[in-house]
Interface confidence: low
């Protein structure tokens, strides 16, 4: 059976930690978990999200001993069958951006723009300065929009 | 290949003690969970004990049925399992298969109590 | 403890026809989106033969024949094209939680 395309899922004692399976699981392409089949080592029962396998599984029903995540360094927020954590995201200050909610071992950072800075695209890698007015603000600048310039010359109301 | 082979059983006395033993192979014996599964004649599969790796600190877990009369234990340097059967009843009589948690079982060796 | 039931108790089915087991579980045996759940087929004087594992994963060496399905608390054996080899008792089993607990059995006969 070690040929067989497993998975790994144990979850036998659930109560008691829980972190037992076998065959573990077992193949589960159906059911997307991450990092379930490697090199033909599987382990029977994932672990769960701000876990890691410390080690990896020789054989169908072989434990997977779960450690938690390096704690505001690593997370995983799926339950997965994988010896690594994902890393924390950066928040580039360089790239205009800070933190809003801090890396916990099961979600990752989440990051915002700085103040005065911008980003008006869904998925923001930098944010971009907000521009400063000579002539006046018709619209302030916002976490995702521009500031709006009046333009030399435009009365004003 | 893995393989399991029971063996241990008899004939015993109601009351009476047995200790069942399960030698395993072609797998790394140390890191796996194991369990004890038994089967009555004509009747369906009950689990009745488990024991987790060094690493799991060799918890154990019984069915109701066998709490404080069945001790399951294992020899990792001889990787091998056993099932320690005290006050032994007649509802006991049955196959007794090692089991991994990969779902292997072995061929089962037979226990039968009965005055 | 999960209680298995498994329906029906016995089942005759002609030769080449489709047969279908169910099980049902007491209550979910679902972790984290993995249902564990086994089938088994067991012949007289044999241990349980694993069959499926984690609800629809086909053991290796198992005829195609063979499928799982399900999830939660609800699953299903299908043997697509009855066998005379398939005559045997049937057994699920969930390992979500200890105890490890089993359907009844399902007899399937040829008929």
């Known amino acids: 059976r070690l040929s067989s395309k497993s998975v790994n899922a144990q979850v036998t004692d659930i109560n008691s930690k829980g972190l037992e399976l076998r065959k573990t699981v077992t193949t589960v392409e159906t059911q997307n978990l991450e990092g379930l089949h490697h090199d033909g080592q599987f382990c029977h029962k994932p672990c769960p999200p701000g876990e890691r396998k410390a080690r990896d599984c020789t054989v169908n029903g072989d434990e997977p001993d779960c450690v938690p995540c390096q704690e505001g360094k690593e997370y995983t927020d799926k339950a997965h069958f994988s010896s690594k954590c994902r890393r924390c995201r950066l928040c580039d200050e360089g790239h205009g951006l800070e933190v809003e909610i801090n890396c916990t071992r099961t979600q990752n950072t989440k990051c915002r723009c700085k103040p005065n800075f911008f980003c008006n695209s869904t998925v923001c890698e930098h944010c971009d300065p907000c521009t400063k007015c000579e002539h006046g603000i018709i619209k302030e600048c916002t976490l995702t929009s521009n500031t709006k310039c009046k333009e030399e010359g435009s009365r004003s109301n | 290949e893995v393989q399991l082979v029971e063996s241990g059983g008899g004939l015993v006395k109601p009351g009476g003690s047995l200790r069942l033993s399960c030698a395993a192979s072609?797998?790394?014996?140390?890191?796996?969970?194991m369990n004890w599964v038994r089967q009555a004649p004509g009747k369906g599969l009950e689990w009745v004990a488990r024991?987790?790796?060094?690493?799991?600190?060799?918890?154990?877990y019984y069915a109701e049925s066998v709490k404080d009369r069945f001790t399951i234990s294992r020899d990792d340097s001889k990787n091998t399992l056993y099932l320690q059967m005290n006050s032994l009843k007649t509802e006991d009589t049955a196959v007794y298969y090692c089991?991994?948690?990969?779902?292997?079982w072995g061929q089962g060796t037979t226990l039968t109590v009965s005055s | 403890d999960i209680v298995m039931t498994q329906s029906p108790d016995s089942l005759a089915v002609s030769l080449g026809e489709r047969a279908t087991i169910s099980c049902r579980a007491s209550?979910?045996?679902?972790?984290?989106?993995?249902?564990?759940m086994q089938w088994y087929q067991q012949k007289p004087g044999q241990p349980p033969k694993l069959l499926i594992y984690?609800?629809?994963n086909v053991e290796s060496g198992v005829p195609d024949r063979f499928s799982g399905s399900g999830s939660g608390t609800d699953f299903t054996l299908t043997i697509s094209s009855l066998q005379a080899e398939d005559v045997a008792v049937y057994f699920c089993?969930?390992?979500?939680?200890?105890?490890?607990?089993f359907g009844q059995g399902t007899k399937l006969e040829i008929k």
């Open positions: 089993q969930q390992s979500t939680k200890v105890p490890w607990t």
């Open positions: 984690v609800a629809s």
């Open positions: 024991i987790r790796s060094k690493s799991n600190n060799y918890a154990t």
């Open positions: 209550e979910s045996v679902e972790y984290y989106g993995t249902s564990l």
């Open positions: 089991v991994t948690d990969g779902y292997y």
């Open positions: 072609g797998f790394t014996f140390n890191t796996n969970a």
